[in-house]
């Protein structure tokens, strides 16, 4: 039919932190570059109708969905969704294609479904139909890579079992330590799964989708390092494959390299051998130990020996679980207003954990990084000096563990007052809890200095925000003194704080602020 | 047999440097690690640092860090303690000790060298 | 850094004595300790490696036990030419430390 118009339907993604329900319109947000959805004319049926490829959303994306219509003349057009009918306004791109968009933004379940555009054009009519799903994420999984030797060759092959299927790479880096930082220039990403070059430094390899990044450094004994401050360990849960690398810089060929296991060799299949010359002339030698998948009786010293290096051990140990070992008692923590501080926690765990630090029910990325002797720490500095309960969370496939924080904020109480018919409320903030005394203010006492006891109750920490303690102090109504202004104050080691409240109105109590130091 | 045989005694200046060698005969100089003891008069023993002679690298006791530096020459199968900024604590007997490699964890020092004295005065 | 703690400072016991020192560290270090002989003006000597394997050429009435924390150096018959002080040295992690040193002396 010569008269239908050339259409074109695309999905664009956006990465947006707005909340809404669908708009029509172009709505400006950051975008994907747009994917396009085919829009093939459907057969047999009534009507020009036209189907975009179907649209796969996960929970909470932003979407746009958009055809652009290369026809003459002007275009009106309407969507339906679920039998609602909602607002269409075409405009004109430069190249005088009419553009007509839907905005979906923070997809929920109630957002799925058909989307129908008609279209009418001076020439023809014709509907535009987009199936919006949400993606079934439940069934996805990112598992840690793992490595295989490759049949017949000397290279190693990188497989991580995920849903969706992940993006693979391989990240190299020759130097040593902190210059081996992900986004080093230093460091070398080969996005693919197989890798031949395996006298690097440092290899890891890498496997992402859309739940995240996992990653395995191959594990490296260097006979030309100083040993580690202490044993090098390495955990793995039965039916793993281990492997580890030992390597060593001589300068000729004149050194062969052993592996042992308890001061047994290790048999043969269980290790290969590969050598280069170095740009210097000397040589590099690398052993592999590998175990395609490991038992209980695989646990031990695994030593690599040289006939011209020291040698070099680690410490296999093979568990049926995954653990995360580390002291959950809870940590209460008292610093100044200004006091550099950070929440750390010491850990040990197999397979690496993935942690959050929660605050006031807000999270927070977590980082953790490896210490020498086999534990790890994450630390936790972004608390902007605010006290109240601070929680470290981590959790791996088999395991999982809380520490509990409380920060408490030196400084000097800050007093808010509150009145009724009966009686008159003051509430507190400041650390160390503060202590009460109310005053009455009269003829005899204008400077406010006799003391009032009794009727008055104190509670400690009657109101717990996120474990932000409250003190308050309650002064029960006496004729004694009904009429006249009281003043509460707060007292800790850092200063004094006061409120001044007249008894006897009976509307709004006016209060006045009294801070002294 | 297994030896190390260490440079003279030495009388430095405080804030001076002293370098002190080790040559090493009888086995694979670059199969073993070598560390640096020293013991003050009438003192125990203390650890300044470990060097890998098949590579050259090197691992610092903390309070040393700064002042020690360890090297190795392979072709004479020696190493050398440089130690700076001399002050009277430093007088004291200065070992090289083979690290053993028998062990899981190449901290044990198997064969000794006689000791070197460095005396710091004014 | 690992604390190395022995006992007794000093010692004094006759020929055919049967001797014992013991060790402490600061934390668990498996079964990493040494333990060194010194005679006054030479190099220390080693003894025993990881607790309790004698080194080359040491007499048989040289002996060591312990793991974890506590350790022992046992000498089952005190000859003339043991009388010296003797170390222990944990191996298990960086820096390797000694302890303060027993001094055997004949009584």
């Known amino acids: 039919n010569q008269d239908l118009p050339v259409i074109k339907c695309v999905l664009i993604n956006h990465k947006n932190n707005d909340s809404s329900v669908g708009k029509s319109s172009s709505y400006p947000m950051v975008s994907e570059s747009p994917e396009d959805l085919g829009c093939a004319l459907r057969p047999q049926s009534s009507g020009t109708v036209y189907e975009a490829a179907a649209v796969e959303v996960d929970v909470s994306a932003s979407i746009t969905l958009q055809v652009l219509v290369d026809a003459p003349g002007n275009i009106s057009c309407l969507w339906v969704f679920k039998h609602s009918s909602l607002n269409c306004q075409p405009h004109f791109d430069l190249q005088n294609r009419g553009v007509v968009s839907m905005v979906i933004l923070k997809m929920t379940e109630t957002q799925a479904g058909e989307y129908l555009l008609f279209i009418q054009s001076e020439a023809t009519n014709y509907t535009i139909l987009f199936t919006v799903s949400i993606r079934n994420t439940l069934l996805y999984t990112l598992r840690r890579p793992y490595f295989r030797k490759m049949e017949n060759q000397d290279a190693l092959v990188c497989i991580s079992e995920s849903v969706p299927e992940p993006i693979v790479e391989w990240v190299l880096c020759d130097s040593q330590g902190e210059s081996c930082k992900e986004e080093s220039p230093a460091v070398v990403k080969k996005e693919e799964k197989v890798l031949h070059e395996l006298f690097g430094t440092d290899i890891r390899c890498c496997a992402r989708n859309e739940l995240g990044r996992e990653c395995t450094r191959l594990f490296t004994i260097d006979l030309n390092q100083t040993p580690q401050t202490t044993l090098p360990q390495l955990f793995l849960k039965v039916g793993e494959p281990l492997w580890i690398r030992c390597k060593a810089v001589h300068v000729n060929h004149g050194f062969g390299l052993t592996w042992e296991l308890e001061n047994k060799a290790l048999e043969e299949g269980n290790y290969f051998e590969m050598s280069t010359y170095s740009t210097n002339r000397t040589m590099i030698r690398i052993l592999f130990a590998f175990v395609s998948s490991v038992a209980r009786n695989d646990t031990g010293y695994y030593t690599c020996s040289s006939s011209k290096h020291p040698s070099q051990s680690a410490l296999v140990t093979i568990v049926e679980k995954g653990f995360i070992n580390a002291t959950n008692s809870s940590e209460d923590y008292e610093i100044d207003q200004y006091e550099e501080f950070c929440f750390s926690v010491r850990f040990k765990a197999y397979p690496q954990i993935r942690c959050t630090w929660t605050f006031s029910r807000k999270s927070f990325p977590c980082e953790q990084k490896g210490l020498d002797n086999g534990y790890s720490i994450s630390k936790f500095c972004n608390h902007k000096h605010q006290p109240g309960e601070y929680i470290f969370h981590a959790e791996n496939d088999d395991a999982q563990f809380t520490k509990m924080f409380t920060l408490n904020i030196r400084r000097k109480p800050q007093v808010l007052a509150e009145a009724s018919a009966s009686q008159a409320s003051c509430f507190s903030d400041g650390y160390p809890l503060p202590s009460w005394t109310w005053k009455k203010c009269s003829d005899k006492s204008p400077n406010c200095t006799e003391e009032i006891t009794e009727g008055v109750w104190n509670r400690k920490a009657n109101r717990k925000v996120f474990g932000q303690w409250v003190s308050s102090s309650t002064l029960n109504m006496s004729e004694a003194i009904k009429g006249f202004l009281v003043k509460c104050c707060a007292y800790n080691s850092l200063g004094t704080s006061c409120e001044t409240i007249l008894l006897n109105s009976p509307g709004p109590f006016p209060f006045i602020q009294d801070n002294i130091s | 047999q297994v030896q190390l045989v260490q440079s003279g005694a030495e009388v430095k200046k405080p804030g001076a440097s002293v370098k002190v060698s080790c040559k090493a005969s009888g086995y694979t100089f670059t199969r073993y690690y070598m560390h640096w003891v020293r013991q003050a008069p009438g003192q125990g023993l203390e650890w300044m640092g470990i060097?890998?002679?098949?590579?050259?690298?090197?691992s610092y006791a903390q309070k040393f860090q700064g002042r020690v530096t360890m090297t190795r020459d392979t072709s004479t199968s020696t190493v050398y303690m440089e130690l700076s900024s001399l002050r009277s604590e430093d007088t004291a007997v200065y070992y090289c000790a083979r690290g053993e490699t028998r062990s899981y964890a190449p901290y044990g020092m198997d064969v000794w060298g006689q000791g070197t004295t460095v005396t710091v005065s004014s | 850094d690992i604390q190395m703690t022995q006992s007794p400072s000093s010692l004094s016991a006759s020929v055919g004595d049967r001797v014992t020192i013991t060790c402490q560290a600061s934390q668990d270090i498996s079964n990493y300790l040494n333990w060194y002989q010194q005679k006054p003006g030479k190099a220390p000597k080693l003894l025993i490696y990881?607790?309790?394997n004698k080194d080359t050429g040491v007499p048989s009435r040289f002996s060591g036990s312990g793991s974890g924390t506590d350790f022992t150096l046992t000498i089952s018959s005190l000859q003339p030419e043991d009388f010296a002080t003797y170390y222990c040295?944990?191996?298990?992690?960086?820096?390797?430390?000694f302890g303060q040193g027993t001094k055997l002396e004949i009584k």
């Open positions: 060097i890998n002679p098949s590579g050259g690298s090197t």
């Open positions: 990881q607790a309790s």
């Open positions: 040295q944990q191996s298990y992690s960086t820096p390797p430390t």
